[in-house]
Interface confidence: low
């Protein structure tokens, strides 16, 4: 009926919370009676959705007021025999619309749970609850779909062609033969989504809806779609029956009639054919924050959002901290822009992520007599003769890279290195072979080389 | 690349139990409803379980031939697929696989004889 | 349930012809259909999904078309690989049903 600040808090706020336009939708979750009321227990006797969704449009300064809910019912199916006790959990969430919204999209904004005891077939039975600082009027009842009947919907009530004991129009029940349906409390033709009676042969109204049948929307004079005007007393009349009897749209789908065959309006969460297949589409605008819906590619993803810069989530729905990979280098300070990412550099560095080096030589001199050189907007020392590394900090180990050929020795020394040649080899570097006939001396071929191999000498 | 691997099964008297499980890689376990699937010579592919995400609940749908007796579940922290299988009949024997929900990903299989 | 019906049972063809494979669902199934490739002692493997949609890796000789009802399976030039069994499959409501395959013979 209606959602709203409830009486007496303080300033009321507006569901849409002044950011602009927004629209509501209506959680509906049944959960046996018996078990312990949990956030993390499954809707066991059923869940639903409301699809009836009207955007409502408001501005900052304006009055709060309750919202005014659509006609639109949340059917929520249950499996078996209706338990009579259960749960009702009843969740409303904001979607905020518009392109200023800012923050998040979805809200969860209340939740309602209470115990309930209610048989199937009784009149709409109405409710006000509160949570927090809101309020929410509404109405309930349980059907039974047919051919289930009774109190808890567990018997069958078929029409038979063979003679049975029930009176006229009446139809014996399964899995009790012996037992007859109960006469047909509303007047026939009661609107079973619009009307209710609480006395045999009434057909009583909800808001909205009007005739005797409780057919006729209390806005129009005239009757809708393909309905056609009928006597006086019975206001607009359905021509026979159509494809969308009985509606065949599953999970609150909404049914119209096209050319001889139908089509359903689906809720949020639900597609296929007649509303049967559970499951999100781009149609159901799943992403967030301004994220590009896309059919996935993968056939377990009914779509994929590609999302902006800024943003991550199978939804979009989180915001990235970028800064936290740490993109500046060199100390750089990060500022996350929304748009863009920006390094503020500290002194002496420079470019996109602070990684060109701006120091010159007069900055940091090199040790241990190293010479300071620049190019290419970076600064690097030549060292010393013993000593390497960005400073020349570090002693150089001038035998590390084995200089000496031939089994040569070498030995660190103040000025470099010397080499002590092994028997029959001479040289700075011991590279040279000493020819017994004293001719001249020659390199000589690594081991494993022959003397006379061209590659070597070419 | 992408991995799943099916154990568990083997051989089982009438009215028996079993529990199979399926370790997933290669892909985000924790964002996939998954099935189990079986197959045999009589029966074909034949659909047993699906197991939605957290968020929904770990809502789960079965087939009518296994309903009350199978139960299908999951871990995300081990990227694990459950299914207990009860009240164990001849014409549950098959190779079960353990797929993602509509089947891109299948593991290689393992095989449940129930027979005396 | 959702029956699906292959045909044919089998299907010998010589390497480089073109084969047509047939699945029909026994109501309307949008095109929330599937076709698996399954060779000798192997899993499934997906090769179209939504109908159409030529799975990733899966060669450009395989195409799927169809919608509602009537769903083909065409190998423009069958190769000696392509012998495997292959099932039409629906995930189009619950519960999910199979087609019971048609086997693919190479000559």
């Known amino acids: 009926h209606s959602f709203g600040p409830g009486p007496g808090l303080g300033t009321p706020r507006s569901p849409c919370n002044a950011r602009g336009p927004c629209r509501l939708f209506f959680r509906v979750c049944l959960k046996p009676g018996v078990s312990q009321e949990a956030t993390e227990s499954l809707c066991a006797l059923g869940a639903a959705l409301s699809t009836s969704v009207p955007v409502y449009t408001e501005h900052p300064g304006e009055s709060a007021a309750a919202l005014p809910l659509p006609d639109g019912l949340v059917r929520v199916p249950f499996r078996d025999a209706w338990p009579g006790t259960f749960s009702l959990v009843i969740e409303t969430w904001r979607e905020q619309l518009g392109e200023h919204a800012g923050g998040p999209a979805w809200n969860l904004l209340a939740r309602v749970v209470g115990r309930r005891r209610l048989a199937a077939g009784g009149p709409w039975a109405r409710d006000v609850q509160r949570t927090g600082t809101w309020e929410l009027h509404f109405s309930y009842r349980a059907r039974c779909e047919p051919p289930a009947v009774g109190a808890a919907c567990a018997r069958l009530c078929r029409s038979r062609s063979a003679p049975s004991r029930c009176g006229p129009g009446l139809r014996p029940c399964t899995p009790f033969p012996d037992e007859c349906e109960a006469p047909s409390v509303c007047r026939p033709g009661c609107s079973p989504e619009h009307g209710y009676c609480e006395e045999p042969d009434e057909c009583r109204c909800l808001e909205g809806w009007t005739g005797p049948l409780c057919t006729v929307p209390v806005s129009t004079s005239s009757c809708l779609n393909s309905r056609v005007p009928g006597p006086a007393s019975t206001g607009c009349l359905l021509p026979g029956p159509g494809p969308c009897d009985g509606n065949p749209c599953a999970n609150g789908g909404s049914c119209s009639e096209t050319s001889g065959s139908f089509e359903c309006a689906c809720p949020r969460g639900f597609y296929g054919l007649r509303c049967e297949v559970s499951g999100v589409t781009c149609a159901d605008g799943p992403c967030f924050n301004g994220g590009l819906c896309v059919g996935g590619e993968d056939p377990d993803s009914a779509y994929v959002c590609h999302c902006p810069p800024g943003f991550q989530g199978s939804n979009c729905e989180k915001r990235v901290d970028r800064c936290s990979l740490q993109p500046c280098q060199n100390g750089g300070l990060c500022l996350d822009l929304g748009h863009a990412l920006r390094c503020r550099c500290r002194a002496g560095f420079a470019g996109p992520r602070c990684e060109h080096d701006l120091d010159d030589c007069a900055g940091r001199a090199c040790a241990n007599g190293g010479t300071c050189v620049e190019g290419g907007g970076s600064r690097r020392c030549s060292c010393a003769l013993g000593f390497g590394g960005r400073d020349c900090r570090e002693r150089a180990d001038p035998c590390a890279s084995r200089p000496c050929a031939h089994g040569g020795r070498c030995y660190a020394h103040f000025s470099g290195l010397v080499c002590a040649c092994a028997p029959g080899y001479m040289g700075v570097r011991c590279e040279f072979a000493v020819r017994p006939d004293g001719a001249d001396a020659v390199p000589a071929a690594p081991r494993g080389l022959r003397q006379a191999d061209p590659q070597r000498f070419l | 690349e992408v991995n799943l691997e099916e154990s568990g099964g083997g051989l089982v008297q009438p009215g028996g139990s079993m529990k199979l499980s399926c370790v997933v890689s290669?892909?985000?376990?924790?964002?996939?409803?998954m099935s189990w699937v079986r197959q045999s010579p009589e029966k074909g592919l034949e659909w047993v379980a699906e197991?939605?995400?957290?968020?929904?609940?770990?809502?789960?749908h079965y087939a009518e031939s296994v309903k009350g007796k199978f139960t299908i579940s999951r871990d995300d922290s081990k990227s694990r697929l459950y299914l207990q299988m009860n009240s164990l009949r001849p014409e549950d024997t098959g190779i079960y696989y353990c797929?993602?929900?509509?089947?891109?990903?299948w593991g290689q299989g393992t095989l449940v004889t129930v027979s005396a | 349930n959702i029956v699906m019906t292959q045909s044919p049972k089998s299907v010998s063809m010589s390497v480089g012809e073109r084969v047509t494979l047939s699945c029909k669902a026994s109501?309307?199934?949008?095109?929330?259909v599937y076709w698996y490739q399954q060779k000798p002692e192997q899993s499934p493997k997906m090769m179209i999904y939504?109908?159409?949609n030529r799975y990733t890796g899966v060669p450009d000789r395989f195409t799927g078309s169809g919608s509602a009802t009537d769903f083909t399976l065409t190998i423009r030039s069958v190769q000696a690989e392509d012998l495997a069994d292959y099932h039409c499959?629906?995930?189009?409501?619950?519960?999910?049903?199979f087609g019971s395959g048609t086997k693919l013979e190479i000559k």
């Open positions: 499959g629906q995930s189009y409501s619950y519960p999910f049903t």
């Open positions: 109501e309307n199934v949008g095109t929330y």
């Open positions: 939504g109908a159409s």
């Open positions: 290669g892909f985000t376990f924790s964002n996939y409803w």
């Open positions: 197991i939605r995400l957290k968020s929904d609940n770990y809502a789960t």
């Open positions: 797929t993602s929900n509509r089947f891109a990903y």
